[in-house]
C-alpha cells in the first residue's frame, strides 16, 4: 500500500484506568496530514465516536478505560499529500494491584516510573499525565506507601509534588492520583513512582553543561555519513542520563527498524572536579527527512540541538 513502516517502543500499561497515545512523528505530522488509528492490522479504523470506550480523538487513541483484552499492536497511518507512514505501537496491558485499603498492602511499583530526588535540596516529582484536550484532569493527590502525603515540606503544584529539603526518608513507593473527566464521565488515573535519593554535589549550579552542540545548524550533503558528538560536563557523582532524542524519543527507538541513525557508546574523561562525557549520534546516510528536524542532546535537565541543513548551492 506504499506506506513506510515505523516501529515505536513498547508501552506497558495498567488495566482499569484511562490511557492515551498521541500519533506524532515530525516532520510528517507538522504539515497537512490525516491520521487514522487501527488495531492489529485490521482494515477497520478505530471508532471516532466519543462514547466508544476505545476511540480516536484527533491524533490520539484514547482508552476509557484500558482493559486486559486491549493488549496488541496498534497502527496509526499518517497520510500526507505525497507520503504515507504507518507507525506501530505495541501496547501491553497488565493488572496492577495498587493499595487496597482492605488489605493495606504496598503497591508493586518496580515497573512504573522511576524518579530521583536530590538529598538536602528542594526538588520535585512529576505525575505524568498525557491525554488529549477533551480530557479534563482534576485535582491530583499524592501518596507515599499508601498514605496521602501532607506536611509543610510537600506542596502539590500542578502535576508536581514539590519536596523541600529532601531527606533519606523520602525514598520509597509513591503514587499520584488524578480524576479524569471525559464527556461527563469520571475516571481515576493512578501512576506509581519508585523514588530513590541521590547525593549529587554541585558543579556549575548542579546542572550539566552541554559544551557542544550549541543549538545550531550543520550543513551536510544528502546521502553522506555524519557523526556529531555531544560533549557534557557534570559532577563526578551525578546520576544524569545523557542521550540523543528526536521528537522526544530516543533515536535508537525512533529508528529502531532501519537503524540508520544510532546513538554511540558514552565515554568520559575524569577531571579533578568534574567529568567530561561524550555521546555521539551517527547518521549512516543523511536523508531528506532529516533536514530541519531538531536532534536533541539531553543531559539531565540540559538540552541542546543540532539541525541538519542542505548546503547552499555553489553557483561558481
Amino acid at each position: 500500500d506504499g506506506c513506510k513502516d515505523i516501529f515505536m517502543k513498547n508501552e506497558i500499561l495498567s488495566a482499569s484506568q484511562p490511557f492515551a497515545f498521541n500519533c506524532t512523528f515530525p516532520p510528517i505530522t507538522s504539515g497537512e496530514v490525516s491520521v487514522t488509528w487501527y488495531k492489529n492490522s485490521s482494515k477497520i479504523p478505530v471508532s471516532k465516536i466519543i462514547q466508544s470506550r476505545i476511540h480516536q480523538d484527533e491524533t490520539w487513541i484514547l482508552f476509557l478505560p484500558m482493559e486486559w483484552g486491549d493488549s496488541g499492536v496498534y497502527q496509526c497511518v499518517i497520510k500526507g499529500r505525497d507520503s504515507c507512514h504507518r507507525i506501530h505501537v505495541n501496547l501491553t496491558v497488565f493488572e496492577k494491584h495498587w493499595c487496597d485499603t482492605s488489605i493495606g498492602g504496598l503497591p508493586n511499583l518496580s515497573d512504573e516510573y522511576k524518579q530521583i530526588l536530590h538529598l538536602g535540596k528542594d526538588d520535585s516529582l512529576t505525575c505524568h499525565l498525557h491525554f488529549p484536550k477533551s480530557c479534563v484532569l482534576g485535582p491530583i493527590k499524592w501518596y507515599k506507601d499508601c498514605n496521602e502525603i501532607k506536611g509543610e515540606r510537600f506542596t502539590v503544584l500542578e502535576t508536581r509534588l514539590l519536596v523541600s529539603n529532601v531527606s533519606a526518608e523520602d525514598r520509597g513507593n509513591y503514587a499520584c492520583q488524578a480524576i479524569l473527566t471525559h464527556s461527563g464521565k469520571q475516571y481515576e488515573v493512578l501512576n506509581g513512582i519508585t523514588v530513590s535519593i541521590t547525593e549529587r554535589a554541585g558543579y556549575g549550579g548542579s546542572v550539566p553543561k552541554i559544551i557542544y552542540p550549541k543549538n545550531h545548524s550543520i550543513e551536510v550533503q544528502l546521502g553522506t555519513t555524519l557523526i556529531v558528538d555531544c560533549n557534557v560536563t557534570d559532577t563526578k557523582d551525578n546520576t544524569n542520563l545523557r542521550c540523543w532524542r528526536v521528537n522526544n524519543t530516543l533515536v535508537d527507538d525512533y529508528y529502531d527498524e532501519s537503524k540508520r541513525i544510532r546513538e554511540g557508546v558514552e565515554t568520559h574523561v575524569s577531571f579533578r572536579e568534574h567529568n567530561l562525557y561524550t555521546v555521539n549520534i551517527t547518521f549512516l546516510e543523511v536523508k531528506m527527512e532529516d533536514y530541519g528536524l531538531p536532534f536533541m542532546c539531553h543531559a539531565g535537565v540540559s538540552t541542546a540541538y543540532i539541525i541538519l541543513q542542505l548546503p547552499a548551492p555553489d553557483f561558481r
Epitope: 491530583i140 500542578e158 514539590l162
Partner: antibody, heavy 120, light 112 residues
Framework: QVQLVQSGAEVKKPGASVKVSCKAS????????MNWVRQAPRQGLEWMGM????????RLNQKFKDRVTMTRDTSTSTVYMELSSLRSEDTAVYYC?????????????WGQGTLVTVSS | DIVMTQTPLSLSVTPGQPASISCRSS???????????FYWYLQKPGQPPQLLIY???NLASGVPDRFSGSGSGTDFTLKISRVEAEDVGVYYC?????????FGGGTKVEIK
C-alpha cells in the same frame, strides 16, 4: 465562567492591619490554590503566597511569613489575605489570582485588584 | 530565589512592525519532566495582568497568534510578529519551577 471579585480600596495607618477578600465563582473552590500578588505604584509584580482551601494549606514567600495570614470561608467561596504591621512600602494594589487549570500553571484568572494605601 | 531579568526596560514600536522582549532566569527552568516552567504576562494600563504564554511556548486561551514564546532553559524570548495598538502595556516574565514564584521587572511597550 471563572470570576474573582475583590473587596474595595482601603486606607490604613502604619502599624495597622488590612484584610482583603477575594470571592470566587464559576469553579470548584476547593480544588485550586488561590495566589496573592501585589504591585506597588509604578513597580513590578511580587508573589506573596498561596492558599489551598482544602486543609487550609498556606505557602508564603519568606518575605511575608511573619506578617501574612490567609484564611477562607468555604460557604461563600471566599479567601482572605491579612497583612499586619503595615508600613508605607506596603502601599500597593493587591491581586488574587488562580491558575489556568489544575495541571497547567500560569495565572489565567485575576481579581480586579484592591488598592491598599498606608499613610499616616 | 530564582531571579528573572528582563531586557529591554522599555520598547517603542511602529504598528505593524515586529517586536521582541527577552528574559533570563538565574536557574534553568527546564524540569526533568521536559516542561519549562516559564510564563509571559501582559498588563495593560489600569488592568490586572493577563496570561499570554504558558510553559514557555504555549499560547494561552484567547491570545492572538501574533504572539509567540521560545527559549532554552534560562534564556527566553517573546515575539510579536506585527505589533498592534492594543499590545501596549508592561510585559512580565515569570517562573513557577519552585517557590517563591518570581516575576521579571517588566518591559514597557509603547507605540511610536
Amino acid at each position: 465562567q471563572v470570576q474573582l471579585v475583590q473587596s474595595g480600596a482601603e486606607v490604613k495607618k502604619p502599624g495597622a492591619s488590612v484584610k482583603v477578600s477575594c470571592k470566587a465563582s464559576g469553579y470548584t473552590f476547593t480544588n485550586y490554590w488561590m495566589n496573592w500578588v501585589r504591585q506597588a505604584p509604578r513597580q513590578g509584580l511580587e508573589w506573596m503566597g498561596m492558599f489551598h482551601p482544602t486543609g487550609d494549606v498556606t505557602r508564603l514567600n519568606q518575605k511575608f511569613k511573619d506578617r501574612v495570614t490567609m484564611t477562607r470561608d468555604t460557604s461563600t467561596s471566599t479567601v482572605y489575605m491579612e497583612l499586619s504591621s503595615l508600613r508605607s512600602e506596603d502601599t500597593a494594589v493587591y491581586y488574587c489570582a488562580r491558575t489556568t487549570s489544575m495541571i497547567i500553571g500560569g495565572f489565567a484568572y485575576w481579581g480586579q485588584g484592591t488598592l491598599v494605601t498606608v499613610s499616616s | 530565589d530564582i531571579v528573572m531579568t528582563q531586557t529591554p526596560l522599555s520598547l517603542s514600536v511602529t504598528p505593524g512592525q515586529p517586536a521582541s522582549i527577552s528574559c533570563r532566569s538565574s536557574k534553568s527552568l527546564l524540569h526533568r519532566n521536559a516542561i519549562t516552567y516559564f510564563y509571559w504576562y501582559l498588563q495593560k494600563p489600569g488592568q490586572p495582568p493577563q496570561l499570554l504564554i504558558y510553559q514557555m511556548s504555549n499560547l494561552a486561551s484567547g491570545v492572538p497568534d501574533r504572539f509567540s514564546g521560545s527559549g532554552s532553559g534560562t534564556d527566553f524570548t517573546l515575539k510579536i510578529s506585527r505589533v498592534e495598538a492594543e499590545d501596549v502595556g508592561v510585559y512580565y516574565c515569570a517562573q513557577n519551577l519552585e517557590l517563591p514564584l518570581t516575576f521579571g521587572g517588566g518591559t514597557k511597550v509603547e507605540i511610536k
